[in-house]
């Protein structure tokens, strides 16, 4: 299939000008390369009438002209003082011969219609109103005033001063005159359909003294929007309809063949196709709304119409306004997997694809919520405080420069099966949709914490140790201290990777961390994981308290949170080597904006605004004799 | 056919009103739907606001919807535009057009146009 787009048909009059747009994949081959526009012949040969390397043909001579906009990854033709000749099947495409990639456009150019001279011409779109003025001298002020539509021999009555009105009329005709002007009256036709296209006569009086004025209403289907979109991102449908049905329920539709099949709207309708990937969100008072996309497929490219309508269906005679979506197969947004298992008191690690062009942009993590118009409240972002349901469980690991970002969710629960969003301030087309899915858990964790009543006691010495299989025996083991910007990757240093070992014991592989004196910053969740370079695995959560020493107390737990500390996970863990660090870190405190919802999905990200690591490991350290071994018996 | 001259252009400072007007002559007024255009430097002729023969139908661009204002006389064959909230970007060539048979207006008609500076 071609990558190129541009408009199926374009349908213009005689004298006018049309200018047509390609899109071609966003490649630098593609933005260098020869650009054309040809004519197809019944041979299927295709003749050049205009191209990028400055080749114009004769019959386009001063007419036409090809603009390139690498940009946008667009060209334009522009074609003026069209004639019929024009009419024709098209190709707009790229490469250095007419047999490139392309798009078939099919261009018809009608004659002007005769209209009696003085004609009066209102262009209106569907779905709007007109008001056709019907001037008169003021002799015919007393008379009856009418309107009609002609049909083939005669000319129907539409309406009159004496409120007779057409029944395809009623509710939709309104004659009337304006303050003291008694040389003018009006007719105002609302919600407009095809079928009130056509001729008009406006009559003022009777007989050979009337006054009458010949009216052409044109009524127009809105050109559709071309969208050219990378399989895998994301899109947004901008809809503005107008004040006049701003409280009127939204929907969006896509054509299928002669009907229109509602996609999602505002009264809570949505096709279960889009589930997890798609919110409708009230823009303003205006009627104003845009409908966000994102995890485009294949079988999302289409037509697309949105409109307003007290039953959110489409409805005729309401305005719309339409879309041609074409997906682009050859996209640049990696191929990552969008179902990701878990098992409950497990943990997921959730590779979030970013534009590497834009590796400074803060980086986000949503949970789509289908109740209502669908939205989609922030959980975690780089400068976005962690949700507090989410503490100790939750923390986004900004990996700049390649491409990915990590999530990584612990103690999972059932309630944590659902869909996420992936999103950033920046190039809204990479918003990602991943399903999480969470099945019980059959066996042991991956991952084990000792001990599991964690109490530390101030100012003596506190060790955690953390269990782990032979299989991840290869992979960088650490410990990391959980905050609500992130977790800090605590220093670690690894004997036992020294020692070349043969055989692995299964009881003894573990990577320990000593708090060494413990103080009361210490309290707080720690988490073990396993990684290879910027490539998280299976991670296990652990609460430490802190007491103060009391006399022939037993140390319990004051929580139960660590009932929920236990990790299982999917086994596709990759070798590492273990890296040295520095060691306890403090995260950068600062200012943060409460704004957390990704509602207003036609703008960017960008409520969060707070200062922190947010997992990276080089926020400030202090200096203390705490040591984090790993030890291999 | 119809003759345009428009006026009341000028330097303004952002946020501040102006009003630009077009006389029409040659013909009865009343026939033609009227409206204004203008055109940035480096850039293409744009739709700015409409009014049909007898005032009955309006248009405006998006930009400017809720700040421009167009209104016709008749009587005295004039058609203004008042502008309030003027801002840099509004800075243009505003021209005058009338068209005997369309509206929204295509511009069968123009006038020479009248400088509009809105400074920051």
């Known amino acids: 299939k071609s990558p190129i787009f541009g408009p199926q048909e374009v349908s213009s009059i005689e004298g006018d000008s049309v200018s047509i747009t390609c899109y071609y994949p966003d490649t630098s081959v593609n933005r260098h390369t020869r650009k054309y526009w040809c004519r197809q012949g019944a041979s299927g040969m295709c003749t050049t009438l205009i191209s990028s390397n400055g080749y114009l043909s004769k019959e386009y001579s001063g007419r036409a002209n090809l603009i390139n906009f690498p940009e946008n990854n667009t060209f334009v033709i522009n074609i003026e003082q069209l004639t019929q000749d024009d009419t024709g099947s098209y190709k707009c495409g790229l490469g250095t011969s007419n047999r490139g990639l392309s798009f078939d456009v099919s261009l018809e150019v009608s004659q002007v219609p005769e209209l009696p001279s003085d004609t009066h011409v209102y262009t209106k779109d569907i779905g709007r109103n007109v008001t056709i003025e019907c001037p008169f001298k003021r002799e015919n002020a007393p008379s009856k005033k009418s309107l009609c539509k002609k049909t083939n021999q005669s000319c129907e009555l539409v309406i009159d001063s004496t409120e007779k009105v057409n029944p395809s009329y009623i509710g939709r005709a309104k004659l009337f005159m304006k303050g003291t002007d008694l040389t003018v009256f009006y007719v105002n036709i609302s919600h407009l359909t095809h079928n009130d296209a056509g001729l008009y006569i406006c009559q003022a009086g009777e007989g050979p003294s009337a006054d009458k004025k010949n009216v052409d209403l044109q009524v127009l289907a809105p050109e559709p929007e071309l969208l050219y979109k990378d399989l895998r991102s994301s899109v947004t449908f901008e809809c503005d309809l107008g004040r006049e049905v701003a409280n009127e329920a939204k929907y969006l539709c896509r054509m299928n063949k002669e009907t229109c099949d509602v996609i999602i709207n505002t009264l809570g309708k949505r096709d279960p196709d889009f589930e997890g990937r798609i919110l409708i969100t009230p823009k303003d008072d205006n009627g104003r709304f845009s409908v966000l996309i994102t995890g485009l497929r294949k079988e999302d490219a289409g037509h697309y119409q949105c409109g307003a309508h007290s039953s959110g269906l489409p409805q005729e005679g309401w305005p719309i306004q339409t879309w041609q979506l074409f997906v682009n197969e050859e996209s640049t947004i990696p191929n990552r997997r969008s179902v990701v298992k878990g098992v409950t008191g497990g943990s997921v690690a959730i590779a979030c694809p970013y534009n590497p062009k834009e590796s400074s942009s803060l980086k986000y993590w949503c949970r789509w919520e289908g109740d209502g118009n669908g939205h989609c409240p922030v959980l975690v972002g780089t400068q976005a405080q962690v949700q507090e349901e989410y503490e100790g469980r939750l923390a986004l690991f900004d990996q700049p420069g390649n491409g990915t970002y990590t999530v990584i969710l612990n103690q999972l629960t059932t309630e944590d099966a659902g869909f996420y969003w992936c999103l950033t301030n920046g190039d809204s087309r990479w918003r990602t949709t991943i399903e999480l899915q969470v099945a019980e858990a059959t066996r042991e964790p991956n991952l084990e914490v000792t001990p599991q009543n964690a109490t530390a006691v101030l100012g003596e010495t506190f060790t955690v140790s953390c269990h782990y299989p032979c299989k991840f025996y290869s992979q960088e083991k650490y410990w990391c201290k959980w905050s609500n910007k992130g977790c800090h990757i605590l220093p670690s240093h690894d004997e036992g990777a020294r020692q070349s070992s043969v055989s692995c014991d299964q009881s003894s592989q573990l990577v320990s961390m000593t708090l060494n004196p413990v103080s009361k910053e210490d309290e707080g969740w720690y988490w073990c994981g396993v990684k290879q370079g910027q490539t998280y695995g299976e991670t296990t959560a652990i609460y430490i308290a802190v007491e103060e020493r009391t006399r022939g107390s037993s140390h319990v737990n004051p929580t139960d949170a660590n009932a929920r500390a236990k990790v299982a996970l999917e086994e596709e863990v990759v070798d590492s080597s273990i890296s040295e660090k520095e060691n306890k870190a403090i995260p950068n405190p600062g200012p943060f904006a409460n704004e957390r919802e990704i509602q207003n999905v036609g703008d960017q990200a960008q409520e969060n605004r707070a200062s922190g690591d947010a997992g990276s490991a080089d926020g400030q350290s202090r200096s203390s004799s705490s040591k984090h071994h790993h030890h291999h018996h | 056919q119809v003759q345009l001259v428009e006026s009341g252009g000028g330097l303004v400072q952002a946020g501040d009103s102006l009003a630009l007007s077009c006389a029409g002559s040659g013909d009865t007024f009343s026939n033609y739907a009227m409206g204004w255009f203008r055109q940035a430097p480096g850039k293409e002729r744009e739709f700015v606001a409409d009014i049909s023969w007898y005032s009955a139908n309006i248009g405006y661009a998006d930009s400017v919807k809720g700040r421009f204002t167009i209104s016709r006389d008749n009587a005295k064959n004039m058609v203004t535009l008042r502008m309030n909230s003027l801002k840099p970007e509004d800075t243009a060539v505003y021209y005058c057009?009338?068209?005997?048979?369309?509206?929204?207006?295509?511009?069968?008609?123009w006038g020479q146009g009248t400088q509009v500076t809105v400074s920051s």
């Open positions: 057009a009338a068209d005997r048979n369309h509206w929204p207006v295509k511009g069968d008609y």
